[in-house]
Amino acid sequence: EDELQVIQPEKSVSVAAGESATLRCAMTSLIPVGPIMWFRGAGAGRELIYNQKEGHFPRVTTVSELTKRNNLDFSISISNITPADAGTYYCVKFRKGSPDDVEFKSGAGTELSVRAKPSAPVVSGPAVRATPEHTVSFTCESHGFSPRDITLKWFKNGNELSDFQTNVDPAGDSVSYSIHSTARVVLTRGDVHSQVICEIAHITLQGDPLRGTANLSEAIRVPPTLEVTQQPMRAENQANVTCQVSNFYPRGLQLTWLENGNVSRTETASTLIENKDGTYNWMSWLLVNTCAHRDDVVLTCQVEHDGQQAVSKSYALEISAHQKEHGSDITHEAALAPTAPL
């Protein structure tokens, strides 16, 4: 071939975001005389990237000195690459023309793909808490990555989950992509200390995946179990009744004692005992002066947990005939257990 050829040796170049991309182009001749230009894309909508003849292109530098005698190397370097720079770049030779230079020959094009890291995955749980045996959804989102190929896995306490659905958007070609995944997790009573992990693997991460976490403690509500019992008598005319509130989570709890349906005392749980599984226990007691009662008393421990509907447990306190003859005030006392942080 005795006519000028435009040689773009690389069909494709892949660059990490933030780096510089070198796009190689060589001519086989000095003639026809005229400038070279670099474009992204082809056709009428192509974007001028560099014009040897004129213009200001702050991100573009020429690899060799273009004014150098017999220079046939028209390679360029584009600095600070972003995903928006992805596309096919053409090195185009123009010949001097009057009044305008005329496109003479184009290189075959070099496809620039930009490797952009995914953002740190953000995991979010349900808006409202759910109780054990129920299924809750967790979502994981990450953005701004390229190329499109990406792997997402879910784990609960180190065990891989299988019930999840993942979408990568957009479906077609784009400068960068986003991933959205929803995992369904069945809660168990022991999940207060559990964690779900969303793990993302991508070519830009060099085998070191990104992880986003969420604590199931934010998603679970373990309702308390109540047990009302009478303790051994301190004195002949006093009855000591305790309400053991066990294995609840979170800590927000209000307890009300009722005597024969009438509110006797309300208290808010403060000093809690934390169990190994992260749930809490609390005990409240009531001292009843049996002399003040002529009839049997029904004592009810009513617990409102985490804003839910109250649950209660009752205890029938029998008043002996001897005690019924003597009247006396009821005294109340709450036993407070040592506290532990939430």
């Epitope: 001749s29 000095l30 005389v33 001097k96 023309g97 009057s98 005329v102």
Partner: antibody, heavy 120, light 108 residues
């Protein structure tokens, strides 16, 4: 100093071909574009085309495509023009010329010309 | 192609006279791309002015050039006998490189 020495006059028959030469000296032959210019008797100058000896690549005036073929031999620092299917219209003086700069501008150096006569 | 038209085609002037010849282009030419040559009978063209107004090496100062766009001119301030020749303008703004038809200067 730069010199372009062209071959002697040619008398050829119509329909034949001719190859004329232009030997360069005084500079690096492969680095500079060489042009060929035609001048018919008593007429103006017409640019035929150019050759870049560095890679033996050419560019022609559309008017002379198929008529003229430009070649070069780097080993002898010589450029050639071959004209085919000659007619009386091809009778002219043919000049080789070199730009002042390596890739263009103005013709600073000219050969003395080769007179081609096409006649039966 | 960019056609260059020179006028007049011929002119006869007396020694010492000032001479101006023009070169008109069909398309605009960059001033750096318009050149003038002098060709005497039986000789090859000799560079006279390049880039509209720059004198080639060894060219006397009585020669000058000017112009822009599509209109250019060559002036000889005081013609001498050795100036008898044909003068050609040439453009290097666009392919194909073209020459004007020439102005033949004759000394009376």
């Amino acid at each position: 100093q730069v010199q372009l020495q062209q071959s002697g006059p040619e008398l050829v028959k119509p329909g034949a071909s001719v190859k004329m030469s232009c030997k360069a000296s005084g500079y690096t032959f492969s680095e500079y574009v060489l042009s060929w210019v035609k001048q018919r008797t008593g007429q103006g100058l017409e640019w035929i085309g150019e050759i870049y000896p560095g890679t033996i690549t050419t560019y022609y005036n559309e008017k002379f495509k198929g008529k003229a073929t430009l070649t070069a031999d780097k080993s002898s620092n010589t450029a050639y023009i071959q004209l085919t299917s000659l007619t009386s219209e091809d009778s002219a003086v043919y000049f080789c010329g070199r730009f002042y700069d390596y890739d263009g501008g103005w013709f600073a150096y000219w050969g003395q010309g080769t007179l081609l006569t096409v006649s039966a | 192609e960019n056609v260059l038209t020179q006028s007049p085609e011929k002119m006869a002037v007396s020694l010492g006279q000032k001479v101006t010849m023009t070169c008109s282009a069909s398309s605009s030419v960059s001033s750096s791309d318009l050149h003038w040559y002098q060709q005497k009978s039986g000789a090859s063209p000799k560079p006279l002015i390049h880039g509209t107004s720059n004198l080639a090496s060894g060219v006397p100062a009585r020669f000058s050039g000017s112009g822009s766009g599509t209109s250019y001119s060559l002036t000889i301030s005081s013609v001498e006998a050795e100036d008898a020749a044909t003068y050609y303008c040439q453009q290097w703004s666009g392919y194909p490189w073209t020459f004007g038809g020439g102005t033949n200067l004759e000394i009376k």
